[in-house]
Structures are given as C-alpha cells and as structure tokens.
C-alpha cells in the first residue's frame, strides 16, 4: 500500500506496511532550485521555507496565461518527494526553495548562477548543518555553470542534479556534466530506463546513478490535499536528494566523496537491462538504483571504491584519455579499454600535485579511454612505481619495495603498435602477489600504498578457450581497487572494474584462433582496511 | 565527469586590434575564449557572463564591468550590467551587443566569457 | 464495512480542554490510503473543518484553530484523538470524526470525507 | 481561506419538483468541490466530488455541475427523503464548508 518508489529505495529491514525508516534527515537543510511552489500544500507545509530569491526569464508565447497551479506545479512535486509528509523520502529534512524557472519550466544558466551564489552568501552568512542542492533542471553543457557548481561542491555543499530527458549522454549537458555534482538518471518500476515520449533518461559515464523516475507519486498544486503522478530525471534527482538528506542526517560529517561512495555502495546493483542504452553506452552507464543504507551507522569499516570513466580519447595516434578522482579520493589503480583494441595502455601520472590516469591511442585505433579506480583511503600515503621496458624474455617487472605498502593496481604502457601480437603469454610467477608484471616492451606501474590496516590479495580468473569476457571478481568483506588482463593476450581491448568484479573484455570470438593466444587472464587486486573495521567497532 | 570535456562550442576569437593597444591586453601569455550553447534554439544571445580569474577581487571585477562599459561607449554601443558575482565565481552579467565580444575578451582579469543560454526542468 | 465512532464528555468547563476520541472499526487506520479528520458544527450552524491526522502521525490543522488543537494517533488501538485547549463557549458544537482519502494511493477513492461518524455534542458550560 | 457562499439558504419545494442549489467559491477551486446532505441529527452524507462525480450509492436524480467559481447541485425529481440541508465542500486550498442550503417541503 505504500508507493512503488519509496518501496523501492527502501531496504528490506524497513518494509513493513508503511515507510518509516529511523531519522527523517532533519538536521539537513535541502535547497530547491526550480519553479515557484504551493508551499501551504499539506505534504510540505511547515517544512519548506520560500526564500525572496527569483530569477527567471518571461514566458515564451503573447498568449501565455499564468495559471498559479501549473507554475508551481513541477517544484511542488519534487519538494514532496524530497520532503513530503506522506510520499516523501526524507520526510523529517526542511526545504529552501529558489525560483529559477518560469511557468512554462525554463529558466537561464545566468539565473541558476546566481541562484547557487545566493545559496553561497546565505551559508557564509549563516552557517547551518549539511546543505544539499537539488538541481532539478539541464540545459546544454555550460563551462560556467559546472564551475560554479565545482566551487560550491568545494565549500562543502553536496550538489544533486537531474541526468536530462533526452535519452541522450549525459555529458551533453549541464549541470549533469559537473564531475563534483551527483547526477541521477531515471528508472521505471521494473528497474528499466524511463522512457518519455520519443525520448528518455539520459545515460552515459556523467551519471553516477539511477533512482525511481516513472509514475511517481507527489504533492500536486492543484490543490492543498491533491497528489499527482510525474515522471522525469527531476524525480529520480529528488529521490538521492532525499536519501542524501537522511544519511547526512544520521552522520553529518559526511564529506562529499564519502557520500558519493556510500550511495554507489548501497544501490542496487546490475538490475538495470542495459539494452535500452546505446550499444556505445552501455560499458560508461552504472548500473546501479539508488536506495537507503540497511543501517544509518557502521558503514565506516568498508573500503570504498568507485569507477570512474574518462571522456573518450579521439582517434587521432597520440591521443590520450583522462579520468581523474574526486579531491578526497585516491587513484588506487588505472586500466584503460578501447573498443578496437588498438590501445597502448596505460599509467598512472601526477597532475597537480595528484595521481590520474591516462590511457594512450595506438595508431589505426578509434579512441580509448581511462578507467581510474578511485578509493577512500583514510591517511594513505600512494605511489607509483615504474619499471620500463626490460630486456628479458621473462617481461617486465615491478613490486612495491617500501616497507609496509601493499599492492592496490597494475597499469603497463608500450610505445610499440602491435604489442605482443605475435608472442605468448607472460605467466605471473606463483608466490609474488606484490608484483605487476608485464611484456619485456611495456613499461609497467604499480600503484602502492601504505594506509593503517590495508591488507590486499591479487585473485586471478584464466579461461583457455577464446572468450569476449572474463571477469573475477572479490568475495565478501572486500573491495576491488585493480583490474588488468594478464599480459601476452593481443586481442584484449581492456579491463575495468564493475562494482566488485574485474572486467576483461576481448574482440569477439569468432575472430579469434583457438590457440593459446586466445587464453585470457582477469586479474583483480582485492583490498580491506583493518583499521576502518577496528575504528567502526570502536564506535559501535 | 569531466569538466573540460563537453560538446560545447568554443570560439577563440584572435586579440590583435590595433584600436586597443597593449594596455588593454590581458595578462600575456593567457588568451581569453568564448563559449555557447552548442543547441542553438537554446542560444540566448545578448546576455554574456563574464568570468574573470579566480583570484580576482569584488572590486577588480566592478572595475572591469565599469571598463568594459566605457569602452563599449566610446564605440557607440550600450551595456547594461546586470550583476556582479562574488561568493562563488568573480565575474559579471552583462546585456550587450555580440559585436563586443572581441573587445570584452580584452580586458584584464577576464579568463572566460560564456553566452547565455536556457535550462529546463527535467 | 467502515464504521467511526467519536467519544468523550459531553461536558467542558470554559479555558479547559476538550478530548475527544474516535475508534475506526471495520477496517485498519494504519492505511497509507486515508488521513482521519475532525469536524465540528455548531448548533443550528454550518461545518467547520478542525485538522486531520495521517498513520504515520503527520498532521494538518485549520489555520484559524492551529494554536489550540492537537491530532494523535494510536494505531495499536485503532483510535485517534482531538484535544483542543482553552475552549470557550464558542466551541460548543457536535464534533464528527470522518475519514477523507490521502491521495497517495489514488485507487482508494475520491479526496473528500466519507463516511463520518454519528457526531458527539460538547456543550463549553460552567 | 476560500470562502463559499450557498444560495438560496432556504428552497421550498414540492415532492417531484426539480431542485436547483447553488455555490460561488470566492476564489477558482477549480472543479475541487463536493456536496453533502445532512438530516436531523445525522452526520453530513457525500453526494457529489470533484463537482460532478456520483460518490458510491447515490442515486442518478443527484447530479452536479460546474467549474471555477459557480457550481450547481441539481436533484431532478424530489423524493421526500431528499429534503435536508445540503452543503457544499472546498478542498483546492484547505478545507471549508458553505453555510448550506435547506429544501423543505412546500
């Protein structure tokens, strides 16, 4: 009897006949950047606070009559599935809203600036708790617009936006495409992507995640007590919003990248069919449903890790990809993927005083790009060690000599085109986990790091016929943070990782030779951290 | 996500105009760009933030607002300021005439300038 | 079928409090169907609406009576309860509980009150 | 507050005879309006929501109309136990009554 969506984000240990999950997030202040809303509706009433803010283009049209109802009705809707009394998700936390869209629902990227730096002074002013930002609305991909939601997102406000209804990449728009900003695609009530009309969510490696965004039941401004079922990224944004709200409200000391981590962690995993994306997407896109932590507290003890895609190379021979981490993350290793298989790998470099990755285009390939595996590592202390090319037949080696540093990744890079095409198999020796190796061409890096506790296992998966994809993946209790092919298999066209699962795709079978050339290793670098599970019972 | 990767359009319009002179110029070695809606309909021409460099104070960014109106004066063209931002990104909003661009790239402290355009609720 | 029935004294002395309770039978008030509100009406007057009550115990009251009236609920007992303080004479009115539709499931039926209960008379009188 | 105002306050009719009762809202409630009978020492009974929906039982001779500000509860052919007050009911902005009606026999 409860609606599908809350249903939906809400664990099972929660579901009974009602939604009541502990704390409401009412120490949490939400602001609303969208239309104007019905605030004395009985879903929000008392608990959404209408600021003096507006800024907001005429209505397009001679003939355009403003109809209170309709102006506020796409505002009114999402405060109630942030907040909402009845059909809310964070029903304890309290609204802000800011006017920047009309009646007709557009607004300007100069009104939305000027809506966040009100957002600013208003927290310099007066310091409240966490502050989250819900940015139901996308226009075209804006430099200005994701700069400024990059400095808010510094100042320690957790930014939440709408992916875009334009069945279309993500990285197209804006705010969608602001890398510190949480970008939420749609999903229906079977766990597939929203349609709307001719079009639908968007998608793409800017998404972080999906939640509920089809028929979703909300506060109507119809009238005081009416409800109205919407659909749309907006309501899939609200939905994180809220979740965001609760969980800062249970430990709001969250940073950012702990939050972003923990929402990856939670979600619903590979429920998505991925048919719907396009063919091209489908490797970028998370699979992945918002929902509620089981519990409010003890999450610390885990080791989180995210994957995040760089944009696409370009086909040009020298081109390279980029991804970078968060500001509070760390690189725990690099891996790189080209749908051609022309590729020449990968390493990890600094930038600015951080470790990114890079992936390099071989000459005939169509572009790649880097699969940066970014991790909250408490007091880590990384590096990167290189071996370069070696002369010897046995390949190229590296191992992580400082004492106390453990492997976390494996990347190797070559300069030749045609790497390994012609030669077999570099077999790893038996009884050194804390070493990469590699072709005697390639320069390998290993990413090693010392942090209280760590403890890291590598855990391969060979298979010896020819096969478009292997994947080994860590059990319980720990967390991927690397994943590579094991050298010597020239028709591999990358590794990433998948939520725990290391990914090792190759060129499609039917091309590929039954010889041992077709064997194809996944090798995964499986972590913990004692020290987070010691700190977390410690506060239990 | 990665903020400098976008299908946007970037337009990088060449700073020799022998009008200005050298005092005008930016910090050397630095070159101002444009940038627009790469969907046209979503264009709204007319309407430009100017962001200037990110250590710029209120004050420098009022200056450059005020510059920017002179020299657009004295070519017979009419500006209207319509914020000045601080708090978040040093810059400002001004209605003006695109034929100004080149000439508001220009001016000291500016790092980038970006057309309005339109966002919707999603 | 759904049946309410509202309870209390029949007797308040003015600046005191007035408490009142309705017991829902024939069906459960932790629905996520309906809200549970109070009306009341006068003698020889017209309807006023008072506040209403969720199971979750969210509340909405009338403006004009917000200061002086608290909606509870206990879905233990199937029961949920007006009090209304500092009662003058001008409170003296037969007071009905009703059930009205939420909204959030919209198959359960139109947003209006029904059905009602058969009302209590509270007479404010020292 | 939305305030709606009934007319006439009292309608004599004969049995058979067709009843019009009508109410202006002082604001747009859009078609959010419903209508109840209420007898002697009964509560108040739902006849008509959303303007001109029949709620469950009520019998075809009931209708309602209108939109906006003016609305109309129409009873085609009086029968006797059809005379009672009626009152009209807003929900676009909270709650409010009308003062009623009262169809007495003639």
């Known amino acids: 009897s409860i609606p599908w969506n809350l249903e939906r984000i809400t664990p099972p240990r929660y579901r009974a006949d009602e939604y009541q999950p502990p704390d409401g997030g009412s120490l949490v202040e939400v602001y609303l950047l969208d239309t104007s809303i019905q605030s004395d509706h009985r879903e929000i009433e008392g608990r959404v606070m209408v600021t003096d803010f507006e800024n907001v283009p005429e209505e397009d049209g001679t003939r355009f009559h403003r109809q209170a109802s309709k102006c506020d009705s796409h505002g009114t809707h999402l405060a109630g599935v942030v907040s909402g009394r009845d059909a809310g998700v964070a029903k304890g936390a309290s609204m802000r809203s800011l006017r920047v869209l009309n009646c007709q629902g557009k607004g300007t990227v100069s009104g939305t600036l000027i809506g966040l730096e009100f957002i600013r002074k208003s927290q310099l002013v007066q310091p409240v708790g966490p502050l989250v930002v819900l940015l139901p609305l996308a226009g075209g991909y804006s430099r200005v617009l994701n700069a400024a939601c990059q400095r808010l997102a510094r100042a320690g406000v957790v930014l939440v936006t709408a992916a875009g209804n334009f069945r279309d990449d993500a990285c197209l728009y804006s705010p969608a495409s602001a890398p510190e900003v949480i970008t939420v695609g749609a999903t229906n009530a079977q766990d597939q992507p929203v349609t709307l009309g001719t079009l639908g969510t968007n998608f793409g490696r800017c998404v972080d995640l999906f939640a509920p965004g089809e028929d979703i039941i909300g506060a109507s401004s119809d009238c005081s007590t009416c409800f109205v079922s919407q659909s749309g990224t907006s309501q899939a944004a609200a939905h994180v919003a809220g979740i965001a709200a609760m969980m800062l409200s249970a430990e709001p000391e969250l940073t950012l990248a702990e939050l972003r981590q923990r929402l990856i962690h939670f979600s619903a995993k590979d429920v998505i069919n991925e048919a719907w994306f396009p063919e091209d997407q489908r490797v970028l896109t998370p699979n992945l449903v918002a929902a509620l932590p089981p519990s409010t507290h003890g999450a610390g003890w885990q080791l989180f890790c995210r994957t995040v895609w760089s944009a696409h190379s370009g086909p040009t021979r020298m081109a390279t990809a980029v991804a970078r981490c968060a500001p509070d993350e760390e690189l725990l290793s690099c891996s790189s993927f080209s749908r051609s298989g022309k590729r020449r790998g990968e390493r990890m470099e600094a930038q600015g005083g951080k470790l990114v990755c890079r992936a390099h285009n071989a000459f005939g390939g169509e572009g790649v790009y880097a699969i940066a595996r970014c991790c909250l590592l408490p007091q880590a202390n990384c590096s990167v060690h290189t071996a370069p090319p070696a002369e010897a037949s046995m390949g190229t080696r590296v191992h992580c000599h400082q004492q106390g540093h453990v492997l976390t990744g494996c990347s190797s890079h070559w300069e030749v085109e045609d790497l390994g095409t012609h030669k077999p198999p570099v077999l790893r020796p038996r009884g050194q986990p804390n070493q990469c190796v590699g072709h005697r061409e390639a320069s390998i890096h290993a990413s090693c790091c010392h942090a209280p506790g760590l403890e890291c296992k590598v855990k391969e998966h060979g298979i010896p016929a020819p096969q478009e994809q292997v994947t080994v993946a860590c059990e319980e209790g720990w967390t991927l943070t690397g994943c590579s092919a094991l050298p010597g298999t020239s028709h591999v066209l990358g590794a990433y990782a998948v939520d725990n699962t290391c990914v090792v795709r190759s060129r499609d079978v039917s091309t590929t030779g039954s010889t041992s050339e077709g064997a194809v290793t996944a090798v995964a670098i499986c972590c913990r951290s004692r020290h987070l599970a010691q700190a977390s019972q410690e506060l239990q | 996500q990665e903020d400098e990767d976008g299908d946007y359009e970037e337009l990088v319009l060449a700073l020799r105009s022998e009008e200005d002179g050298l005092a005008e110029a930016p910090e050397h070695g630095t070159t101002a760009t444009f940038h627009r809606c790469a969907k046209d309909p979503w264009r709204l021409p007319g309407t430009y933030v100017v962001v200037l460099k990110e250590e710029t104070h209120l004050s420098q960014s009022e200056r450059t607002a005020r510059r920017l109106q002179a020299q657009a004066a004295r070519r017979g063209y009419l500006t209207k300021i319509l914020h000045v931002f601080h708090g978040l990104l040093p810059g400002f909003l001004v209605k003006m005439s695109g034929d100004l661009l080149e000439l508001a790239l220009k001016l000291p402290h500016v790092d980038y300038i970006e057309e309005d355009s339109s966002v919707f609720a999603q | 079928q759904l049946q309410l029935q509202e309870s209390g004294p029949g007797l308040v002395k003015p600046s005191e409090t007035l408490s009142l309770t309705c017991t829902v039978s024939g069906g459960s008030i932790s629905s996520s169907s309906y809200y549970w509100g109070w009306i009341r009406q006068p003698p020889g007057k017209g309807l006023e609406w008072i506040g209403s009550i969720y199971y979750s115990g969210s509340t909405y009251y009338n403006p004009s009576l917000k200061s002086r009236v608290t909606i509870s609920v206990d879905t233990s007992k199937n029961q949920f309860s007006l009090k209304l303080s500092s009662v003058t004479a001008a409170d003296t009115a037969v007071y009905y509980c009703?059930?009205?539709?939420?909204?959030?499931?919209?198959?359960?039926?139109?947003?209006?009150?029904?059905?009602w209960g058969q009302g209590t008379l509270v007479t404010v009188s020292s | 507050e939305i305030v709606l105002t009934q007319s006439p306050a009292t309608l004599s009719l004969s049995p058979g005879e067709r009843a019009t009762l009508s109410c202006r809202a002082s604001q747009s409630v859009s078609s959010y309006l419903a209508w109840y009978q209420q007898k002697p020492g009964q509560a108040p009974r739902l006849l008509i929501y959303?303007?001109?929906n029949r709620a469950t039982g009520i019998p075809a001779r009931f209708s309602g109309s209108g939109s906006g500000t003016d609305f109309t509860l129409t009873i085609s052919s009086l029968e006797p136990e059809d005379f009672a007050v009626y009152y009209c009911?807003?929900?676009?902005?909270?709650?409010?009554f009308g003062g009623g009606t009262k169809v007495e026999i003639k």
């Open positions: 959303d303007a001109s």
């Open positions: 009911q807003q929900r676009r902005n909270w709650f409010t």
């Open positions: 009703a059930r009205e539709n939420s909204g959030v499931v919209p198959a359960a039926g139109p947003n209006w009150f029904d059905p």
